[in-house]
Every structure is written in structure tokens, then in C-alpha cells.
């Protein structure tokens, strides 16, 4: 359950977190503290709405260790770190007589070829479709002869050379020169049933996050793949509306598998290129997964090759406290892969599930023979820990109070990584390097940067790690930095945002309170955004905005312009966020506190949330509201139901409504199974229904689009229906063949326009 | 060199119990899965259960489900199958077999113990 | 369960002869089937797995071959030390099962 990535700037995204930061300059309001002094115009609905302020990104690619690719007025550009110079690469010329609009691009790793990516046709979060042609760039010009099909749902390049594998109406095809014909591997594939080197529907959402299960050794001879078996898979229906012409709607089914319901199976299969033959059909060998996972329903949740002929492999538990990895080899003699017992590394957890969502990914060695991987300590902070292949206990190299969120890179003498041990502030992002020879020579690369204006970072390594982009993306206006890994030298800023930062000079600008209250001797974090010329003596309406999943984050360091800069800009609305029990990234106490207790302790800790909240004294408590989106849209209509008396109204986009109607593989992560044996009696507990009763006393606002292939429809369907069968007087609104992002141009405007007029009336606000 | 040498069969009546063991050398049982698998007299192979010391997990067949148990003991580099309430259907060579790969293949077999269960 | 069903149940050969022995899974287990050899009075012995992977020692006379639900072994040139009954197992689910055995006889 992710919150939807389209909506801009991902406001309803599970991040954020932040401390008493100082604000950034370009937050501040300029010249006076006097709101009637102030002429400047507010940042208005319509300023979201139309993308009036743009940030601007600065998106590369490495394709070495020392040049990446970007774009500037559509021409491709190559930058050589070394020499600091730019050069064009391709021009934007190139493909006018080409007769499609292209929508993406991908050099070969050998700079010889260019796939064309056109006809996007978007299926789920990651999942798409399209067509592709390749052009030869020492010919320059396009390859007509064996052209990959129309509606391939998945291409990727080897990582060395030029070999392309793709799926095609679910099976697989690989492609040693991209003028010859395709070699086919796979004879299985079909539309809802088996899926080779593609995800099915859960797999894509909840485990992979991708759409591919295809993944080359590191120098293209083998090629790895699951096969999903959706045979027994139920089907959820709905209809497509489509153009008003259509006189039958088109009823849409996908296998999506429900709590407890019958999940898809999976296989994993390894096949050489370098031995495909037009004579005989390619021979996949599968490597099975272990015994301790055949034994019962298992999922695969990490593939990551350590050498040449070494592949690891993690498995997981359909009750997700268990998974194992699998370190095999290959073997010549027998042409099969040999998964060691003694290889086998267990991950397990007493407290709650592996993983933040997943088992992390290993970060192996040169050689194959080590790995580090991020896994909770004893005290159940998650941090990294060296592995040995053959070792079973491993040793941790970070330890603290605090988070590693990710390892970024790894060379032989330094491991990179993310973390939020910057001044004790969970909703922090700095990079630091770790000498490997010696584990107490920490550096933070980032912290000290420029601290005022940029508290949470991301990276981006070249190739083998010489270089690295930093991306600041807050508290301050993004900015993105070029690096030298060799002193950490700042070499050159590529955007900075000058431009964005002139024009909000002239925008009254909310600013935003990032601080901690504590709850039985625990930090919980929260941030405001609060109106411009806040004045702590006046009180202002509130706005909770909230998600609340297991592992999320919604006080952070993070820039954002969007519906919540609106509503405190030019509607006076403090609009705060608070990470209670369940958050993410301080550690497994609290993150595990609503194990098997969805709709608990996270729900009732927005309400306290909201309480303390009204005794800051700026709170008009009389006027505090409620909203979320997905998971939010959970626990905003629990709040609301569970009759607190605190929140005058609220709205619940998009809503699980009960746990039983959500996908196997995310409920039963936090949930178990919904059976007698196991946690029934709390899935019929934790229904948004059962508090049908409790909305006589609130305004509620229900929305949800039709077509939503994630959260169903149904969820909100039977909200609706429980309310009007004991008599709740609600507002609804549905957005006809929309999906969980409720994302398209017309539908967007709609949902947060009739949002605010829902708020403001909510308020009395004119 | 690797050995399984299984011990503890005999004749014992319906009903009654027997503990076979299955001590392992030249490997450590912690390394590897440990099977146990029947032959009645004259017939084919018959899988029993299965066991990975290190993860603590174990596998029954149906026929034996409840009444037959298999463990471990890493420090003696051995593996235990309890068998109770045992039946004249169970009468058989008992082989412990290993496996270091983590498919459940059997690379190396013990002798077998023979259990002969009869009033 | 998945049923691996032998045949022939047994054979009569001479020393040199080609033998196959086919092995049937009641569903489909890819390549996940061993091959192991017993002897009168012995433990059976591991000779193929993963369908057609030869296993360390054995000699190169024993191939194995198939996928999905069919299977077969092949030994290109009986030897006299061959004679014996030989199983097929598969491992592609619990519970493991065997296949009842075909018994390799002296012509």
C-alpha cells in the first residue's frame, strides 16, 4: 500500500519527519511580520493546481565511471566529470523524421545502440506497455530488421554490451545482436496466468516494486527470471467505464489475492545466453527454493548477483517473520546451481516482520564471498552488518539511537550510505562513508554542506563510485550538487533553484515547524506547516494530514509545494503530520508496536496527536480536521469513527475499510492470517464499519475512483453502505475510471478543488 | 570421509516406540538437511521426514504425521527419529540420508536400521 | 502429493546395451527429479539431479533428461556392476516421493 505516486510532489507519500530545523530562508516571510503590511500574493489552489511554480530537477544517468547522459532543451547531453566538460550526445533533431513521440530512452552499456521507447500505455503502478526501436549510433540510423513487437511489456540492455532481453505476452525473448532474430526462451507465458520475467499483479505492488523479474549476471552470459503462477489466483472485477459511447461497460479482472486468500506460486529459473541456439529450445535450470520455505506458502523477495557465476537468493514465509537467503553457485560439471545449506542465512524477527517491507538486499564484495545488508540490531535499530558466506553470525559495523536507511555504494575501501543519525532527527537523509578497514572512521559527506538549507539527501554514484550527485531536496529549495568520491570534493552545482527562489520572493510562503512531543517517555515527531505571519498568540484551524502505515515517515526535511502550501498560504491553515507508533526509521519499538494491530495504537495516536496539538494554544480546537489518502484514508475514517469528540470533520480518500478486502501480501505482513487460528477475531475488529455509529457526530467526505486496481472500490462501497444503514448523513464522491492515484489532469483538479471547498466550509472559511 | 551410521532398530510390539539415531561424520549436520526415508521389505523408497538443525525446522509425511518425531543434536553431530504408536505398516529399513545443497536431494545415505514392528 | 510413476518395472539387458527408464510425475515438477541406484543389501546412491545434472563420480555413462511431468534415465552402455533397481524422486514439493522403482536385470 503506497500512497499515490502521481500526485505532485508526492503529498500523500509516506515521508516526512523533521525536527526544529531552522527554516529555510526561502520559506520565510520577507520584510515584515505584519500580514496586513504584506502586499505579495499568497500561493494559491490554482498555483498547485497549475504547476504555477515548478521545481526544477536535474536528472542524470551514468553510463561510466566518470560521464552521465542528461537532457537540455531535448538534446541528450554526456558530461565528463573528468575534464568538466559537456558535450552533445545526441541531438534533439535526431528523431524528427522518427513519426512517434518518444517517451523514454536507453543506451547499450557499450554506447553502440539506443532503444526507443513510444506507445506507453500504462497497466498498474510500474507495470506498462509499449513498442521500441533501436537506433545504431555508429550508423546513425534506425534498425528495421527483427524489430522488437508492439506491446512489449518489459526491455532491458545487458550490463555489458549490447544484449537485450524482453517479455512479450508474458514470456520471455532474448536478443544477442539487435538486428538478428530473437532467441526465445520461455514457451509458458500466459495473459493472467503465468507470468515469466514479469510480475504479477502483488508481486509487482508489494514485493518487487517493479514490473520486471528478469535479471542479467553482471557480464550478460546468464540470464535469471521467476515464473509466477497465478492459476488459482481469485479475480477482482470492475467495470470500465470507458467513452460515453460504450454502451456496456468493460469489466476489468486482474488475479489480485485478498487476505488469506490463495496466492500466486512462484518459480525461479536461470538460463546461459551465450549457449542459445536456433536448433534447439534454450534450457532454463531452475534452482528450487529451500526446503524450510517448499514446506509452505513463500514468496521470492530479492534477487542480486554477486559474481560472474554466484547469485543469491532471498525467500520469505507467507508469514512474513522468516525469510532465507540462498547463496548459489554455478557448476559446470553438471550445469546446475548448487545452493549450499551452509550458505543459508536466516532472517528472522520476535517482534514483528523482516524488513522494513522486505528483506533488504545484500551488497556483496568484489569476490562473492562477503556481503553487508541492513538488518535490525539487538536493540532494534536497523543497521549494517558484514557477512561472510560461509559464517552464520555476521558483524555490525553502525551502530545507534538511529537509522541506516540505505547502502548507496560499496568499493574497496569504503561502503556509502544513507542515514538519519544527523543531530538525533529520524526525518533527517545524510550520506556518510565507513572505511572498511577500520569500522570506526565514519565521515558524513553531506552534513555539513550547507546545513540551513539542506537536512535531507540522495545520491547518485557513477559507475564504480568515483563521483557522486548529491540531491538536497530540503528543508530548503532543491539543490543538486556534482562530487568527487576521491577527496569528496564539491566539484560543481548543477541546479540550484535560483530561478524558483526569485519568483517566491513575491509569494507570502508558509513556513514549517519540524519538533517532538514525548509520549510515555518516547520522541514522536511531527511537523507544521504553518500560515504565513503566524502569529503564536491568534489560533488557526488544523488540518491532520495523515497516513500512518507501518514504516512511514510524514515529518521530514522535505521541500514541498503543494495542496497543504495552499491551504496554510492562502487559507490560514496550519496543516501538521504526526508519526506515531508504527512510523518508520526509529527503530523496532516503535515500528513494531502495531504488529498484528492494524487500526490501533497508530490510529489512536493521531488523536492524542491532535489533542496535545490543541494545547499549544494557537489551535482553534473547535476546527481541527482530518484527512489521508490509501492508508491515510484507513485512519482518518477510524479516527473519525472512534468518537473522540477532537476532529470536526474530515476525508477519507481512497480507503482500506477492512483488512480482508486488501492484497495478501502487505496485510498479512503486519496482519497474519485471517483465520480463527490465527488473528480473525482482530480483522473483524479493525473495520472502518463497525464504526458506522460514531459519524453521526462528524462530516465526513468520501472519495474513491472506480477503477481502482489497488485499493478497491468495494472498500469504500461498503463504507458507504454501513453508513447509510444506520442513518449517517455523509458527503461522497466518486471518480469515474480512476485508479489509487486519482491521478489524471481533469480528475486531480476536480478532487482537490471540491477537497477544499469541503475544508474551507468545514472551517466557516469564505 | 563422510558417514551416517544409523543405530536403535529392532523388533518391537504394535504400539510400542523406538528412538533411531543417526550419527553423522566427516560433516556437520548444521551444514545440511537430514532425511529420513523407509524401505518395507521387498518395496520401493518411502520419504519419512526431514530436518535442518540449524533452522529448527521440520517435515513429516502424512503416514507418520503425529506420531513420528526428528531431531537434532548439533553438539553430538546427530540426528534422532522418535517413532511412537507404531504399526505393523511401519516394519522397514530406516536409512538417514543428507543433503549440503539446499534442494531436498539426498547426496549420501546411511546403511539403514531395521525396524521390524510385530506382536 | 505429487505420484512419479515408473516404467518398465523392471527390464532384462545385456552388458552393453542401451537402457532407459522412464519416470512419469503426476504433475508438473520442472526439472526437479533425482535418480538414485540401489543394490541388493545397500543404500541407494545418488546418480542425477535437476533432471540431467550428473553428480560428482558418477559415471558419464548415466545421463538424465526431461522437464515438466515426463522423465527419463539413460545408461548409453550397460556395465555389469549396473544391474540394479533404480528410483526416480522428485523434489519440486513436500512430501517427497519416490517413483516404486524399475529392477535392471541379467538378460
Known amino acids: 500500500m503506497k500512497t499515490p505516486w502521481k500526485v505532485l510532489l508526492g503529498l500523500l507519500g509516506a515521508a516526512a519527519l523533521v525536527t526544529i530545523i531552522t527554516v529555510p530562508v526561502v520559506l520565510l516571510n520577507k520584510g515584515t511580520d505584519d500580514a496586513t503590511a504584506d502586499s505579495r500574493k499568497t500561493y494559491t489552489l490554482t498555483d498547485y493546481l497549475k504547476n504555477t511554480y515548478r521545481l526544477k530537477l536535474y536528472s542524470l544517468r551514468w553510463i561510466s565511471d566518470h560521464e552521465y547522459l542528461y537532457k537540455q532543451e531535448n538534446n541528450i547531453l554526456v558530461f565528463n566529470a573528468e575534464y568538466g566538460n559537456s558535450s552533445v550526445f545526441l541531438e534533439n533533431s535526431t528523431f524528427d523524421e522518427f513519426g512517434h513521440s518518444i517517451n523514454d530512452y536507453s543506451i547499450s552499456p557499450d554506447g553502440q545502440f539506443i532503444l526507443l521507447e513510444y506507445n506507453y500505455v500504462k497497466q498498474w503502478r510500474h507495470s506498462y506497455t509499449a513498442s521500441y526501436d533501436i537506433y545504431d549510433l555508429n550508423k546513425r540510423q534506425l534498425i528495421t530488421e527483427e524489430r522488437i513487437p508492439n506491446n512489449t511489456q518489459w526491455v532491458t540492455w545487458s550490463p555489458v554490451g549490447h544484449k537485450l532481453a524482453y517479455v512479450w505476452n508474458n514470456d520471455i525473448y532474448v536478443k544477442i545482436e539487435p538486428n538478428l532474430p530473437s532467441y526465445r526462451i520461455t514457451w509458458t507465458g500466459k495473459e493472467d496466468i503465468i507470468y515469466n520475467g514479469i510480475t504479477d499483479w502483488v508481486y509487482e505492488e508489494e514485493v518487487f516494486s517493479a514490473y520486471s523479474a528478469l535479471w542479467w549476471s553482471p557480464n550478460g552470459t546468464f540470464l535469471a527470471y521467476a515464473q509466477f503462477n497465478d492459476t488459482e489466483v481469485p479475480l477482482i472485477e470492475y467495470s470500465f467505464y470507458s467513452d460515453e459511447s460504450l454502451q456496456y461497460p468493460k469489466t476489468v479482472r486482474v488475479p489480485y489475492p485478498k487476505a488469506g486468500a490463495v496466492n500466486p506460486t512462484v518459480k525461479f529459473f536461470v538460463v546461459n545466453t551465450d549457449s542459445l541456439s536456433s536448433v534447439t529450445n534454450a534450457t532454463s535450470i531452475q534452482i528450487t527454493a529451500p526446503a524450510s520455505m517448499l514446506i509452505g506458502d513463500h514468496y521470492l523477495c530479492d534477487v542480486t548477483w554477486a559474481t560472474q557465476e554466484r547469485i543469491s537468493l532471498q525467500w520469505l514465509r507467507r508469514i512474513q517473520n522468516y525469510s532465507v537467503m540462498d547463496i548459489c553457485d554455478y557448476d559446470e560439471s553438471s550445469g546446475r546451481w548448487n545452493c549450499l545449506v551452509a550458505r543459508q542465512h536466516i532472517e528472522m524477527s520476535t517482534t514483528g516482520w523482516v524488513g522494513r517491507f522486505r528483506p533488504s538486499e545484500p551488497h556483496f564484495t568484489l569476490d562473492g564471498n562477503s556481503f553487508y545488508k541492513i538488518i535490525s540490531n539487538e536493540e532494534g535499530y536497523r543497521h549494517i552488518c558484514y557477512f561472510q558466506i560461509d559464517k552464520k553470525d555476521c558483524t555490525f559495523i553502525t551502530k545507534g539511537t538511529w537509522e541506516v536507511i540505505g547502502i548507496e555504494a560499496l568499493t574497496s575501501d569504503y561502503l556509502y550510505y544513507i542515514s538519519n543519525e544527523y543531530k538525533g532527527m529520524p526525518g533527517g537523509r545524510n550520506l556518510y562513508k565507513i572505511q572498511l578497514s577500520d569500522y570506526t572512521k565514519v565521515t558524513c559527506l553531506s552534513c555539513e554542506l550547507n546545513p540551513e538549507r539542506c537536512q535531507y539527501y540522495s545520491v547518485s554514484f557513477s559507475k564504480e563510485a568515483k563521483y557522486y550527485q548529491l540531491r538536497c531536496s530540503g528543508p530548503g529549495l532543491p539543490l543538486y550538487t556534482l562530487h568527487s568520491s576521491v577527496n569528496d570534493k564539491g566539484l560543481r552545482v548543477l541546479e540550484d533553484n535560483s530561478a524558483l527562489d526569485k519568483m517566491l520572493q513575491n509569494v507570502q510562503m508558509p513556513s514549517k515547524k519540524l519538533d517532538f512531543i514525548i509520549l510515555n517517555e518516547t520522541k514522536f515527531w511531527y511537523q507544521m506547516i504553518l500560515p504565513p505571519h503566524f502569529d503564536k498568540s491568534k489560533k488557526y484551524p488544523l488540518l491532520l494530514d495523515v497516513y500512518a502505515g507501518p514504516c512511514s515517515q510524514k515529518a521530514d526535511t522535505v521541500f514541498r509545494l503543494n495542496w497543504a502550501t495552499y491551504l496554510a498560504s492562502t487559507e490560514n491553515i496550519i496543516v501538521a503530520s504526526f508519526d506515531g507508533r508504527g512510523s518508520g526509521y526509529q527503530g523496532d519499538k516503535i515500528m513494531h508496536a502495531i504488529n498484528r494491530r492494524l487500526g490501533t495504537f497508530e490510529v489512536e495516536d493521531q488523536i492524542e496527536a491532535a489533542r496535545q496539538f490543541s494545547k499549544m494554544g494557537f489551535v482553534d480546537n473547535k476546527r481541527i480536521a482530518i484527512w489521508g489518502w490509501s492508508y491515510g484514508g484507513y485512519v482518518t475514517s477510524m479516527v473519525l469513527g472512534s468518537g473522540s469528540g477532537v476532529f470536526k470533520c474530515g476525508i477519507a480518500v481512497a480507503p482500506v475499510s477492512r483488512w480482508e478486502y486488501y492484497d495478501s501480501v502487505y496485510t498479512e505482513r503486519y496482519m497474519g492470517l485471517p483465520t480463527p487460528e490465527d488473528n480473525l477475531d482482530h480483522y473483524r475488529n479493525s473495520t472502518v464499519m463497525s464504526r458506522a455509529e460514531n459519524f453521526k457526530q462528524v462530516e465526513y467526505l468520501l472519495i474513491h475512483g472506480t477503477a481502482d486496481d489497488n485499493v478497491h472500490f468495494q472498500q469504500s462501497a461498503q463504507i458507504s453502505k454501513a453508513l447509510v444503514d444506520v442513518g449517517v448523513d455523509f458527503q461522497a464522491m466518486w471518480y469515474t475510471d480512476e485508479d489509487h492515484g486519482i491521478a489524471s489532469s481533469t480528475a486531480h483538479q476536480h478532487i482537490y478543488t471540491h477537497m477544499s471547498h469541503f475544508i474551507k466550509q468545514c472551517f466557516s472559511l469564505p | 570421509e563422510v558417514q551416517l551410521v544409523e543405530s536403535g532398530g529392532g523388533l518391537v510390539q504394535p504400539g510400542g516406540s523406538l528412538r533411531l539415531s543417526c550419527a553423522a561424520s566427516?560433516?556437520?549436520?548444521?551444514?545440511?538437511?537430514i532425511h529420513w526415508v523407509r524401505q518395507a521389505p521387498g518395496k520401493g523408497l518411502e520419504w519419512v521426514a526431514w530436518?535442518?538443525?540449524?533452522?529448527?525446522?521440520?517435515y513429516y509425511a502424512d503416514s507418520v504425521k503425529g506420531r513420528f518425531t526428528i531431531s537434532a543434536d548439533t553438539s553430538k553431530n546427530t540426528a534422532y527419529l522418535q517413532m511412537n504408536s507404531l504399526r505393523a505398516e511401519d516394519t522397514a529399513v530406516y536409512y538417514c540420508?543428507?543433503?549440503?545443497?539446499?534442494?531436498?536431494?539426498?547426496?549420501?545415505w546411511g546403511q539403514g536400521t531395521l525396524v521390524t514392528v510385530s506382536s | 502429493d505429487i505420484q512419479m510413476t515408473q516404467s518398465p518395472s523392471s527390464l532384462s539387458a545385456s552388458v552393453g546395451d542401451r537402457v532407459t527408464i522412464t519416470c512419469r510425475a503426476s504433475?508438473?515438477?520442472?526439472?526437479?527429479v533425482a535418480w538414485y541406484q540401489q543394490k541388493p543389501g545397500k543404500a541407494p546412491k545418488l546418480l542425477i539431479f535437476?533432471?540431467?545434472g550428473l553428480y560428482s563420480g558418477v559415471p558419464s555413462r548415466f545421463s538424465g533428461s526431461g522437464s515438466g511431468t515426463d522423465f527419463t534415465l539413460t545408461i548409453s552402455s550397460l556395465q555389469p556392476e549396473d544391474f540394479a533397481t533404480y528410483y526416480c524422486?522428485?523434489?519440486?514439493?513436500?512430501?517427497?516421493?519416490f517413483g516404486q522403482g524399475t529392477k535392471v536385470e541379467t538378460k
Open positions: 540420508a543428507r543433503f549440503l545443497g539446499s534442494s531436498s536431494i539426498m547426496d549420501y
Open positions: 566427516g560433516f556437520t549436520i548444521n551444514d545440511s538437511y
Open positions: 530436518i535442518w538443525p540449524y533452522g529448527g525446522f521440520t
Open positions: 504433475q508438473d515438477v520442472n526439472s526437479n
Open positions: 535437476g533432471s540431467g
Open positions: 524422486q522428485q523434489y519440486s514439493s513436500y512430501p517427497l516421493t
